[in-house]
């Protein structure tokens, strides 16, 4: 049986979480992929997703989350920049494969963000706040609103993308701004 495992990352406010999710190249290269948060007792919430079909090495940014899908490496790179204490939680990468259930990629990430920073003199601990401004050409994919295949009431929408501008940042601390996607039980 596949055992769900977690990998813990302890970071300070202002720093960047940078993880890579490994997937089967031949199977999932162009599949839509998503970054989700799992809160206790709740369904996973999708915070950001790639376009559909997923584009190779094409950054998709939703607020402080940047997704890059490297098809030729079978890797989804996820960065959460300028971390806030409120970002602490359990996260996972998934691959959408309708009408089947999303495919979860190992490992889940247990993010712990604490106040302040423990830098060495001269280290650019908070540089990510400046480095990762949203470029005007970065696309922001709309994530599909899937319901459980056992109770499907609507088909997943066709791929839609709009242009993200520097002032369109989503604040992850405001849960009303999170793209909410019910995923399967």
């Amino acid at each position: 049986a596949t055992k769900l495992t977690e990998e813990k990352y302890e970071l300070k406010e202002g720093q960047t979480l940078d993880v890579k999710c490994d997937y089967t190249l031949e199977k999932f290269a162009s599949s839509q992929k998503a970054w989700q948060i799992i809160r206790d007792g709740e369904m996973p919430k999708t915070l950001a997703c790639t376009e559909r079909p997923s584009k190779n090495s094409h950054p998709v940014q939703v607020g402080r989350i940047i997704l890059e899908d490297y098809h030729d490496h079978g890797l989804l790179r996820v960065r959460m920049v300028n971390l806030q204490v409120e970002d602490s939680g359990l996260y996972q990468c998934v691959i959408y494969q309708p009408p089947k259930e999303p495919h979860m990629l190992f490992d889940r990430i247990r993010l712990v963000v604490t106040k302040g920073f423990s830098g060495t003199p001269g280290s650019n601990e908070n540089s990510t706040q400046n480095v990762y401004k949203i470029p005007p050409t970065t696309t922001k994919a709309l994530c599909p609103l899937y319901t459980s295949p056992r109770t499907v009431t609507q088909a997943p929408p066709k791929s839609t993308a709009d242009v993200s501008t520097p002032d369109s940042e989503i604040n992850l601390t405001n849960v009303t701004d999170i793209i909410r996607v019910p995923v399967f039980n």
Partner: antibody, heavy 119, light 108 residues
């Protein structure tokens, strides 16, 4: 408990071949990339090769490209390294290492197997 | 390819003292850095990853800091079992992921 056990090391002449194996247990083998890292006597660590969990993606250090082939059998939980056209500078302890689930660092290591290339 | 440079090559410290090891990357790697400990005749062991996070079972006297190009591994109070060689390794993206040349921590 994660366990990695290498085998197949030994003495081989320059230009010869050798196949290293690593038997893995204690984790969901096909969910993780695996690597070979080597260490020449008295020297530092040198990354050699990595293979993705499904086996669909492989990476090699320039020093071994075209001579070494990494492969895995997910049904048997084994990782292999086929080494051809061996050179004296390939002499090292070869470690099998499990790649972490979130990034390309190594969270578990085998005990290593010594490969000596000498005439 | 990113070059990782560790300093000093050898660090002589008395038991109970603090040890500070440095690792520098030739280009920014954000916090994509791991530290390993290797004792003679043994395989390396993961200490720190993501520049700051201690691996499972690693005592809290080991701590990592830094980001970008400059990183530090600090051992707050050296125990006899801490005398070993320490390596840093970058993992900014896919391989090759390079190691530093190592710092040997020896008894003063």
């Amino acid at each position: 408990e994660v366990q990695l056990l290498e085998s197949g090391g030994g003495l081989v002449q320059p230009g010869g071949s050798l196949r290293l194996s690593c038997a893995a247990s204690g984790f969901t083998f096909n969910a993780y990339a695996m690597s070979w890292v080597r260490q020449a006597p008295g020297k530092g660590l040198e990354w050699v090769s990595t293979i993705s969990g499904s086996g669909s993606t492989t990476y090699y250090a320039d020093s071994v490209k075209g001579r070494f082939t990494i492969s895995r059998d997910n049904s048997k939980n084994t990782l292999d390294l086929q080494m051809n056209s061996l050179r004296a500078e390939d002499t090292a302890v070869y470690y099998c290492a499990k790649v972490a689930g979130s990034n390309f660092f190594f969270d578990h290591w085998g005990q290593g197997t010594l490969v000596t290339v000498s005439s | 390819e990113i070059v990782m440079t560790q300093s000093p090559a050898t660090l002589s410290v008395s038991p109970g003292e603090r040890a500070t090891l440095s690792c520098r990357a030739s280009q920014s790697i954000n916090a994509n850095l791991a530290w390993y400990q290797q004792k003679p005749g043994q395989a390396p062991r993961l200490l720190i990853y993501g520049a700051y996070t201690r691996a499972t079972g690693i005592p809290d006297r080991f701590s990592g800091s830094g980001s970008g190009t400059e990183f530090t591994l600090t051992i707050s109070s050296l125990q006899s079992e801490d005398f070993a060689v320490y390596y840093c390794q970058e993992f900014i993206l896919f391989p090759p992921n390079t190691f530093g040349q190592g710092t040997k921590v020896e008894i003063k």
